[in-house]
Protein backbone atom coordinates (compact mmCIF):
# COMPACT_ATOMS: atom_id res chain seq x y z
CA UNK A 1 0.00 0.00 0.00
CA UNK A 2 1.48 3.40 -0.78
CA UNK A 3 1.11 6.93 0.81
CA UNK A 4 0.14 9.49 -1.20
CA UNK A 5 2.42 12.35 -0.99
CA UNK A 6 2.17 14.90 1.69
CA UNK A 7 1.01 18.65 1.28
CA UNK A 8 1.78 19.26 4.89
CA UNK A 9 2.94 22.48 5.11
CA UNK A 10 5.98 23.48 6.53
CA UNK A 11 6.88 26.83 8.50
CA UNK A 12 10.01 28.20 8.34
CA UNK A 13 11.51 28.28 12.05
CA UNK A 14 10.61 31.00 14.28
CA UNK A 15 13.99 33.37 13.71
CA UNK A 16 14.87 32.36 10.26
CA UNK A 17 13.59 35.54 8.46
CA UNK A 18 15.18 37.33 11.27
CA UNK A 19 18.65 35.75 10.45
CA UNK A 20 18.02 35.86 6.65
CA UNK A 21 17.25 39.82 7.35
CA UNK A 22 20.57 40.37 9.09
CA UNK A 23 22.84 38.29 6.46
CA UNK A 24 20.99 40.28 3.70
CA UNK A 25 22.10 43.78 5.22
CA UNK A 26 25.42 42.49 5.75
CA UNK A 27 25.91 41.78 1.89
CA UNK A 28 24.31 44.89 0.96
CA UNK A 29 26.90 46.78 3.30
CA UNK A 30 29.84 44.75 2.95
CA UNK A 31 29.12 43.85 -0.83
CA UNK A 32 31.53 40.36 -0.77
CA UNK A 33 32.85 39.25 -4.23
CA UNK A 34 32.36 35.60 -3.27
CA UNK A 35 28.65 35.56 -1.46
CA UNK A 36 28.65 32.43 -0.28
CA UNK A 37 31.66 32.59 1.82
CA UNK A 38 30.52 35.59 3.33
CA UNK A 39 27.84 34.10 4.49
CA UNK A 40 29.35 30.88 5.61
CA UNK A 41 31.84 33.45 7.49
CA UNK A 42 28.82 35.57 9.02
CA UNK A 43 27.06 32.50 10.33
CA UNK A 44 30.03 31.27 11.86
CA UNK A 45 30.35 34.55 13.45
CA UNK A 46 26.72 34.75 14.76
CA UNK A 47 27.79 30.94 16.44
CA UNK A 48 30.83 32.49 18.12
CA UNK A 49 29.08 35.25 19.27
CA UNK A 50 25.83 32.84 20.39
CA UNK A 51 28.97 30.77 22.58
CA UNK A 52 30.93 33.54 24.23
CA UNK A 53 27.72 35.67 25.21
CA UNK A 54 25.20 33.28 25.34
CA UNK A 55 22.76 35.64 23.12
CA UNK A 56 21.38 33.90 20.41
CA UNK A 57 19.85 36.53 17.70
CA UNK A 58 17.48 33.64 16.10
CA UNK A 59 15.84 33.39 19.46
CA UNK A 60 15.70 37.02 19.90
CA UNK A 61 14.19 37.32 16.45
CA UNK A 62 11.67 34.60 17.07
CA UNK A 63 10.70 36.64 20.84
CA UNK A 64 10.86 40.16 17.98
CA UNK A 65 8.11 37.87 16.00
CA UNK A 66 5.80 36.62 18.80
CA UNK A 67 5.84 40.06 20.23
CA UNK A 68 2.37 40.41 18.68
CA UNK A 69 1.25 37.76 20.23
CA UNK A 70 2.84 37.32 23.77
CA UNK A 71 4.60 40.29 24.99
CA UNK A 72 5.65 38.64 28.25
CA UNK A 73 8.38 36.60 25.84
CA UNK A 74 9.63 39.85 24.77
CA UNK A 75 10.71 40.84 27.79
CA UNK A 76 12.12 37.61 29.62
CA UNK A 77 15.59 37.84 27.14
CA UNK A 78 16.58 41.45 26.35
CA UNK A 79 19.60 41.76 23.73
CA UNK A 80 23.02 42.03 25.90
CA UNK A 81 23.90 45.13 23.00
CA UNK A 82 20.59 46.98 23.17
CA UNK A 83 22.60 49.84 25.04
CA UNK A 84 25.30 50.00 22.46
CA UNK A 85 24.22 50.39 19.20
CA UNK A 86 27.59 50.35 17.56
CA UNK A 87 27.95 47.14 18.94
CA UNK A 88 25.24 45.94 16.37
CA UNK A 89 27.60 46.10 13.51
CA UNK A 90 28.60 42.46 13.13
CA UNK A 91 31.88 41.32 13.44
CA UNK A 92 32.78 40.88 9.47
CA UNK A 93 32.48 44.88 8.89
CA UNK A 94 35.30 46.30 8.11
CA UNK A 95 35.14 47.77 4.74
CA UNK A 96 36.83 51.31 4.74
CA UNK A 97 35.06 54.49 3.71
CA UNK A 98 37.28 54.98 0.40
CA UNK A 99 34.44 52.00 -0.89
CA UNK A 100 31.44 53.59 -1.02
CA UNK A 101 32.88 56.49 -2.92
CA UNK A 102 33.27 54.08 -5.62
CA UNK A 103 29.59 52.58 -5.76
CA UNK A 104 28.03 53.57 -9.10
CA UNK A 105 24.36 54.69 -8.97
CA UNK A 106 22.51 57.57 -7.27
CA UNK A 107 21.09 56.66 -3.28
CA UNK A 108 17.65 56.69 -4.61
CA UNK A 109 18.08 53.88 -7.42
CA UNK A 110 20.77 52.43 -5.10
CA UNK A 111 18.19 51.92 -2.02
CA UNK A 112 15.30 50.60 -5.15
CA UNK A 113 18.11 47.51 -6.12
CA UNK A 114 19.15 47.06 -2.57
CA UNK A 115 15.37 45.97 -2.07
CA UNK A 116 15.01 43.86 -5.00
CA UNK A 117 18.31 42.67 -4.10
CA UNK A 118 17.61 41.44 -0.45
CA UNK A 119 14.22 39.88 -2.05
CA UNK A 120 15.89 37.83 -4.36
CA UNK A 121 18.60 37.21 -1.42
CA UNK A 122 16.01 35.88 0.84
CA UNK A 123 14.24 34.50 -1.80
CA UNK A 124 16.93 32.22 -2.75
CA UNK A 125 17.62 31.00 0.48
CA UNK A 126 14.22 30.09 0.95
CA UNK A 127 14.22 28.26 -2.54
CA UNK A 128 17.00 26.71 -1.08
CA UNK A 129 15.40 25.14 2.27
CA UNK A 130 12.15 24.22 0.76
CA UNK A 131 13.90 22.03 -1.65
CA UNK A 132 16.04 20.60 1.81
CA UNK A 133 12.48 20.17 3.19
CA UNK A 134 10.55 18.64 -0.21
CA UNK A 135 14.19 16.21 -0.06
CA UNK A 136 13.17 15.38 3.33
CA UNK A 137 9.65 14.55 2.08
CA UNK A 138 10.49 12.73 -0.27
CA UNK A 139 12.70 9.95 1.68
CA UNK A 140 10.21 10.14 4.02
CA UNK A 141 7.45 8.78 1.88
CA UNK A 142 10.07 6.46 0.36
CA UNK A 143 10.85 4.91 3.11
CA UNK A 144 7.28 4.48 4.38
CA UNK A 145 6.30 2.93 0.89
CA UNK A 146 9.01 0.29 1.94
CA UNK A 147 7.89 -0.43 4.84
CA UNK A 148 4.22 -0.91 4.24
CA UNK A 149 5.36 -3.48 1.21
CA UNK A 150 7.79 -5.19 3.46
CA UNK A 151 4.65 -6.14 5.73
CA UNK B 1 34.56 24.33 -13.45
CA UNK B 2 34.05 28.04 -14.26
CA UNK B 3 35.38 29.36 -17.14
CA UNK B 4 35.48 32.65 -18.28
CA UNK B 5 35.20 33.36 -21.87
CA UNK B 6 36.15 37.01 -23.79
CA UNK B 7 35.13 38.58 -26.90
CA UNK B 8 37.76 39.03 -29.48
CA UNK B 9 40.74 41.66 -30.47
CA UNK B 10 39.40 45.35 -30.79
CA UNK B 11 40.92 48.43 -32.57
CA UNK B 12 39.44 51.76 -32.05
CA UNK B 13 39.70 55.32 -32.88
CA UNK B 14 40.87 58.26 -29.50
CA UNK B 15 37.34 59.22 -28.43
CA UNK B 16 35.60 56.19 -29.24
CA UNK B 17 34.07 53.58 -26.66
CA UNK B 18 34.32 49.96 -26.39
CA UNK B 19 32.25 46.95 -25.02
CA UNK B 20 34.51 44.09 -23.79
CA UNK B 21 32.22 41.21 -22.54
CA UNK B 22 33.26 38.11 -20.34
CA UNK B 23 31.26 35.44 -20.52
CA UNK B 24 30.70 32.56 -17.25
CA UNK B 25 30.29 28.92 -18.38
CA UNK B 26 29.33 26.43 -15.66
CA UNK B 27 28.73 26.90 -11.74
CA UNK B 28 26.83 29.95 -10.25
CA UNK B 29 27.40 33.06 -11.63
CA UNK B 30 25.13 35.86 -9.48
CA UNK B 31 26.90 35.56 -6.17
CA UNK B 32 30.33 36.19 -7.17
CA UNK B 33 31.54 39.59 -8.53
CA UNK B 34 33.57 40.00 -11.63
CA UNK B 35 36.17 42.59 -11.74
CA UNK B 36 37.93 44.07 -14.78
CA UNK B 37 41.58 44.19 -14.55
CA UNK B 38 43.63 45.67 -17.43
CA UNK B 39 47.53 45.54 -18.58
CA UNK B 40 49.32 47.80 -20.56
CA UNK B 41 52.06 46.59 -22.70
CA UNK B 42 54.96 45.95 -20.88
CA UNK B 43 52.92 47.46 -17.71
CA UNK B 44 51.79 45.98 -14.47
CA UNK B 45 48.09 44.59 -13.49
CA UNK B 46 45.56 47.70 -12.91
CA UNK B 47 42.32 46.74 -11.14
CA UNK B 48 39.41 48.41 -12.87
CA UNK B 49 36.09 48.19 -10.91
CA UNK B 50 33.96 45.44 -10.56
CA UNK B 51 30.19 44.11 -10.59
CA UNK B 52 28.05 41.97 -7.99
CA UNK B 53 25.52 40.87 -10.35
CA UNK B 54 22.72 39.19 -7.19
CA UNK B 55 23.01 42.83 -6.24
CA UNK B 56 23.25 45.19 -9.49
CA UNK B 57 25.79 47.19 -7.84
CA UNK B 58 28.97 48.08 -9.63
CA UNK B 59 32.28 49.60 -7.36
CA UNK B 60 35.40 51.17 -10.07
CA UNK B 61 39.00 52.98 -9.06
CA UNK B 62 38.74 56.48 -8.79
CA UNK B 63 40.90 56.77 -12.10
CA UNK B 64 38.60 54.99 -14.50
CA UNK B 65 35.50 57.10 -12.44
CA UNK B 66 33.14 58.02 -15.11
CA UNK B 67 34.41 56.30 -17.90
CA UNK B 68 34.21 53.09 -17.38
CA UNK B 69 30.32 51.27 -17.23
CA UNK B 70 31.08 47.75 -15.31
CA UNK B 71 26.92 45.78 -16.43
CA UNK B 72 25.61 41.90 -16.01
CA UNK B 73 23.20 40.14 -17.71
CA UNK B 74 22.52 37.88 -15.49
CA UNK B 75 19.93 35.59 -18.12
CA UNK B 76 23.03 35.14 -20.33
CA UNK B 77 25.42 35.08 -17.23
CA UNK B 78 27.84 37.79 -18.96
CA UNK B 79 29.38 40.53 -18.03
CA UNK B 80 30.18 43.57 -19.73
CA UNK B 81 32.66 46.11 -19.68
CA UNK B 82 32.72 49.56 -21.67
CA UNK B 83 35.50 52.24 -21.63
CA UNK B 84 34.53 55.33 -22.90
CA UNK B 85 36.65 58.38 -24.22
CA UNK B 86 39.48 56.34 -25.22
CA UNK B 87 42.58 57.67 -25.81
CA UNK B 88 45.94 55.77 -27.08
CA UNK B 89 46.97 54.93 -23.14
CA UNK B 90 44.04 53.03 -22.78
CA UNK B 91 45.83 50.30 -25.39
CA UNK B 92 46.14 47.44 -22.88
CA UNK B 93 45.11 43.75 -22.48
CA UNK B 94 41.57 43.64 -20.62
CA UNK B 95 41.24 40.61 -18.42
CA UNK B 96 38.04 39.73 -16.47
CA UNK B 97 38.59 37.52 -12.69
CA UNK B 98 36.59 36.14 -10.56
CA UNK B 99 36.34 33.42 -7.40
CA UNK B 100 35.80 30.10 -7.59
CA UNK B 101 33.62 28.14 -5.64
CA UNK B 102 36.50 26.22 -3.96
CA UNK B 103 37.53 29.61 -2.52
CA UNK B 104 36.37 30.57 1.33
CA UNK B 105 37.80 34.19 0.71
CA UNK B 106 34.88 36.92 0.69
CA UNK B 107 37.21 39.26 -0.95
CA UNK B 108 39.61 38.97 -4.20
CA UNK B 109 40.73 35.03 -4.79
CA UNK B 110 40.48 35.61 -8.41
CA UNK B 111 41.09 31.88 -9.62
CA UNK B 112 39.43 32.02 -12.74
CA UNK B 113 40.45 34.28 -15.58
CA UNK B 114 39.39 34.95 -18.55
CA UNK B 115 41.73 35.09 -21.57
CA UNK B 116 42.15 38.57 -22.07
CA UNK B 117 40.90 41.07 -25.15
CA UNK B 118 43.20 43.38 -26.67
CA UNK B 119 42.18 46.38 -27.08
CA UNK B 120 44.16 48.89 -29.40
CA UNK B 121 43.21 52.53 -29.40
CA UNK B 122 45.30 54.30 -32.61
CA UNK B 123 43.97 56.72 -35.21
CA UNK C 1 44.20 54.56 -1.20
CA UNK C 2 46.30 51.39 0.04
CA UNK C 3 49.78 51.27 -1.61
CA UNK C 4 51.88 48.07 -1.82
CA UNK C 5 55.39 47.78 -2.46
CA UNK C 6 56.69 44.85 -3.44
CA UNK C 7 60.84 43.90 -3.98
CA UNK C 8 62.86 43.15 -5.25
CA UNK C 9 61.57 44.27 -8.40
CA UNK C 10 64.09 41.44 -10.28
CA UNK C 11 64.77 38.40 -9.22
CA UNK C 12 67.64 35.92 -10.99
CA UNK C 13 67.83 32.45 -9.36
CA UNK C 14 69.32 29.29 -10.16
CA UNK C 15 66.82 25.96 -10.34
CA UNK C 16 66.43 24.76 -7.14
CA UNK C 17 67.58 27.57 -5.29
CA UNK C 18 64.68 29.36 -2.60
CA UNK C 19 63.52 33.00 -4.00
CA UNK C 20 61.54 35.72 -1.56
CA UNK C 21 59.16 38.08 -2.66
CA UNK C 22 58.24 41.07 -0.08
CA UNK C 23 55.11 42.95 -0.45
CA UNK C 24 54.40 45.88 1.99
CA UNK C 25 51.33 47.84 2.52
CA UNK C 26 50.77 51.12 3.79
CA UNK C 27 47.99 49.96 6.23
CA UNK C 28 46.69 46.47 7.42
CA UNK C 29 45.25 44.23 5.74
CA UNK C 30 43.42 42.50 8.81
CA UNK C 31 40.24 42.95 8.50
CA UNK C 32 37.59 41.96 11.67
CA UNK C 33 37.05 38.91 10.56
CA UNK C 34 40.50 37.70 11.36
CA UNK C 35 41.88 36.97 7.66
CA UNK C 36 44.82 39.32 5.69
CA UNK C 37 43.34 40.14 2.55
CA UNK C 38 46.38 39.77 0.57
CA UNK C 39 46.58 37.76 -2.70
CA UNK C 40 49.89 36.57 -4.87
CA UNK C 41 49.59 35.52 -8.67
CA UNK C 42 51.63 34.95 -11.03
CA UNK C 43 51.59 35.92 -14.58
CA UNK C 44 53.93 33.90 -17.13
CA UNK C 45 54.92 35.14 -20.27
CA UNK C 46 51.79 35.37 -22.66
CA UNK C 47 49.46 33.79 -20.32
CA UNK C 48 46.58 35.39 -18.21
CA UNK C 49 47.32 35.73 -14.32
CA UNK C 50 46.94 32.38 -12.16
CA UNK C 51 46.19 32.63 -7.98
CA UNK C 52 49.02 30.93 -6.22
CA UNK C 53 47.87 32.22 -2.63
CA UNK C 54 45.07 33.74 -1.23
CA UNK C 55 44.13 35.20 2.75
CA UNK C 56 47.92 35.96 2.89
CA UNK C 57 48.76 32.21 3.45
CA UNK C 58 46.07 29.83 1.83
CA UNK C 59 47.51 28.19 -1.32
CA UNK C 60 45.15 28.23 -3.85
CA UNK C 61 43.74 24.81 -5.92
CA UNK C 62 46.70 22.54 -7.33
CA UNK C 63 48.93 25.46 -6.68
CA UNK C 64 52.62 23.14 -5.90
CA UNK C 65 53.18 23.38 -2.19
CA UNK C 66 56.89 24.48 -2.98
CA UNK C 67 54.61 27.73 -2.93
CA UNK C 68 54.11 29.34 0.41
CA UNK C 69 52.67 32.69 2.34
CA UNK C 70 53.27 34.26 5.32
CA UNK C 71 52.83 37.78 7.27
CA UNK C 72 50.67 39.75 8.81
CA UNK C 73 49.03 43.33 8.84
CA UNK C 74 51.20 45.15 6.66
CA UNK C 75 54.28 43.01 5.57
CA UNK C 76 53.75 39.17 3.76
CA UNK C 77 56.33 37.07 2.13
CA UNK C 78 56.23 34.69 -0.96
CA UNK C 79 58.17 31.95 -0.71
CA UNK C 80 59.42 29.31 -3.47
CA UNK C 81 61.66 26.70 -1.43
CA UNK C 82 62.87 25.34 -4.61
CA UNK C 83 62.51 27.25 -8.14
CA UNK C 84 61.82 25.29 -11.07
CA UNK C 85 62.31 26.47 -14.55
CA UNK C 86 58.46 27.02 -15.14
CA UNK C 87 58.18 29.66 -12.12
CA UNK C 88 59.44 32.45 -14.42
CA UNK C 89 57.41 35.45 -14.57
CA UNK C 90 56.21 38.36 -13.13
CA UNK C 91 54.98 37.74 -9.33
CA UNK C 92 52.44 40.15 -7.74
CA UNK C 93 50.72 41.36 -4.73
CA UNK C 94 47.37 42.28 -4.61
CA UNK C 95 45.02 44.08 -1.54
CA UNK C 96 41.55 42.89 -1.20
CA UNK C 97 40.80 44.44 2.39
CA UNK C 98 39.04 47.34 0.41
CA UNK C 99 38.11 48.55 -3.17
CA UNK C 100 39.86 50.12 -5.41
CA UNK C 101 41.93 46.61 -4.91
CA UNK C 102 45.45 47.35 -6.01
CA UNK C 103 48.22 44.97 -6.80
CA UNK C 104 51.75 45.51 -6.05
CA UNK C 105 54.30 46.97 -9.13
CA UNK C 106 55.66 43.00 -9.70
CA UNK C 107 58.47 41.16 -9.02
CA UNK C 108 60.16 39.59 -12.36
CA UNK C 109 61.91 35.88 -11.27
CA UNK C 110 64.31 35.07 -13.83
CA UNK C 111 66.31 31.52 -14.31
CA UNK C 112 70.39 32.44 -14.22
Known amino acids: MSIPFSNTHYRIPQGFGNLLEGLTREILREQPDNIPAFAAAYFESLLEKREKTNFDPAEWGSKVEDRFYNNHAFEEQEPPEKSDPKQEESQISGKEEETSVTILDSSEEDKEKEEVAAVKIQAAFRGHIAREEAKKMKTNSLQNEEKEENK | QVQLQQSGAEVKKPGSSVKVSCKASGGTFSSYAISWVRQAPGQGLEWMGR????????NYAQKFQGRVTITADKSTSTAYMELSSLRSEDTAVYYC????????????????WGQGTTVTVSS | EIVLTQSPLSLPVRPGEPASISCRAS???????????LDWYLQKPGQSPQLLVY???NRASGVPDRFSGSGSGTDFTLKISRVEAEDVGVYYCMQAVQTPYIFGQGTKLEIK
Open chain 2, 97 to 112: ARPSEEVVAAYGAFDI
Open chain 3, 55 to 57: LGS
Open chain 3, 27 to 37: QSLLRSDGFNY
Open chain 2, 51 to 58: IIPILGIA
